[in-house]
């Protein structure tokens, strides 16, 4: 048999003006009781017992997982990166078999030449980390490499990111540009052939918070926003207090529903409170509207 | 790992000559291109010849031409500097440089591995 919990009652009147007598389970959300072996829970939406208490699946918490939570945590990267797949012809070198083989001698020191002459070349970019090379091929040596990118998580990193891509393109064209050979030598660290230079692919992170949000509140996404805070996004109800979105519940309590954020207006012993933000007191004794 | 070792320099007198030699060892390749840079006091190192481990490229500077041969002896893992009519000009340090790539290169920065050097002197 299903234990019966005693539910405790709070004399609330709801924004429409009628007194209601509510348990402290939101009484709007779905049940579903999860029941573990001879004991029983009132776990509902989704959570479960694990001998102790409710287990609780975000947004809800509470002795049964009733209720919304005010703000669920979301987690941008610290760091967010991009990775720009390139090309370039170096006529520096000769090319030989074994600069195929990434565990040769060969291609040991070719990489370290070519990542000194990258890092020379990109050093004004903060963002830049390195380059990886993916691939050598016949033609002086077709380098077809990565260049990271990587830079701290603000709401603007995509626009940091784009930025230093294009400084990316700018040196590694100015450098490929200018450090060609001359009398079929090189007098630089290396020498590239201008027109085997080329851009194949950017990624960039995808970290959306709004997203990230949305997800997290699950039937409540509607009614959950992102509000920033120091560069870091909070994700909010109108329940949660502090924000630019705060509902001010005034004379009551702000809860969340399926169909929002609603007030529910308090009853003390000299006022009753209504009105869609619990604002308007009513005196008990002379029915006097204070506004 | 590659170690170079220079040997042969000296003091001679305007137009004789002299021959240097390298001793690599520690290569694991097979393959690899050699070179003779010199530094003269005050002045920065400069490339004078190198050359492919096939020996299918050899690449003069202009102030050389025609006076140096480079040459190497692969069984010996040997490479040469054949200096005649030396000039006064000529005095430096002369040092053997290696790589395992096939550098078409005379910047010395491009150059991994380095002998400490000979000395060669030029005077009457």
């Known amino acids: 048999p299903l234990a019966t919990i005693p539910v405790s009652t709070t004399s609330l009147t709801s924004s429409e003006g009628s007194t209601i007598s509510t348990p402290s389970v939101d009484i709007s959300t779905p049940v579903t009781t999860s029941i573990v072996g001879d004991q029983c829970s009132r776990c509902k939406n989704g959570g479960f017992w694990d001998g102790l208490k409710c287990q609780c699946l975000t947004p809800y918490y509470g002795e049964s997982c009733e209720e919304v939570v005010n703000s669920i945590d979301i987690a941008p990267p610290e760091t967010v990166s991009a990775q720009m797949e390139l090309t370039v012809t170096v006529t520096s070198v000769k090319f030989t078999d074994e600069l195929k083989n990434h565990s040769s001698q060969e291609f040991r020191e070719f990489n370290k030449t070519f990542t000194e002459q990258m890092n020379i070349v990109y050093s004004g970019i903060p963002e830049y980390v390195g380059v990886n090379i993916t691939n050598l091929r016949l033609g002086s040596v077709v380098v077809e490499h990565d260049v990271l990118l990587r830079t701290k998580y603000t709401p603007e990193y995509k626009t940091a990111l784009d930025n230093a891509t294009e400084v990316v393109k700018q040196k590694i064209t100015k450098v490929t540009t200018e450090q060609i050979m001359t009398n079929d030598n090189c007098s630089a660290l290396m020498c590239f052939n201008t027109t085997g230079t080329q851009v194949q692919n950017i990624t960039v992170t995808q970290y959306d918070p709004v997203e990230e949000c949305r997800q997290k509140a699950e039937e409540y996404e509607d009614y959950f926003l992102v509000e920033y805070r120091d560069q870091k996004p909070y994700c909010i109800s109108p329940c949660e207090s502090g924000f630019n979105a705060s509902k001010n519940c005034n004379h009551g309590k702000c809860q969340m529903s399926q169909n929002g954020a609603r007030c529910l207006c308090v009853t003390t012993e000299t006022h009753w409170y209504s009105g869609e933000d619990c604002n308007q007191g009513t005196q008990k004794s002379h029915h006097h509207h204070h506004h | 790992e590659v170690q170079l070792v220079e040997s042969g320099g000296g003091v001679v007198q305007p137009g004789g000559s002299l021959r240097l030699s390298c001793a690599a060892s520690?290569?694991?390749?097979?393959?690899?291109?050699m070179a003779w840079f010199r530094q003269a006091p005050g002045k920065e190192r400069e490339v004078v010849a190198f050359?492919?481990?096939?020996?299918?490229?050899?690449y003069y500077a202009d102030s050389v031409k025609g006076r140096f041969t480079i040459s190497r002896d692969n069984s010996k893992n040997t490479l040469y500097l054949q200096m005649n009519s030396l000039r006064a000009e000529d005095t430096a340090v002369y040092y053997c440089?290696?790589?395992?790539?096939?550098?078409?290169?005379?910047?010395?920065?491009?150059?991994?591995?380095w002998g400490q050097g000979t000395m060669v002197t030029v005077s009457s």
């Open positions: 520690g290569y694991t390749s097979n393959r690899y291109s």
């Open positions: 050359i492919w481990t096939d020996g299918g490229r050899t």
């Open positions: 440089a290696a790589s395992s790539l096939l550098l078409q290169t005379i910047n010395p920065r491009a150059w991994p591995y």
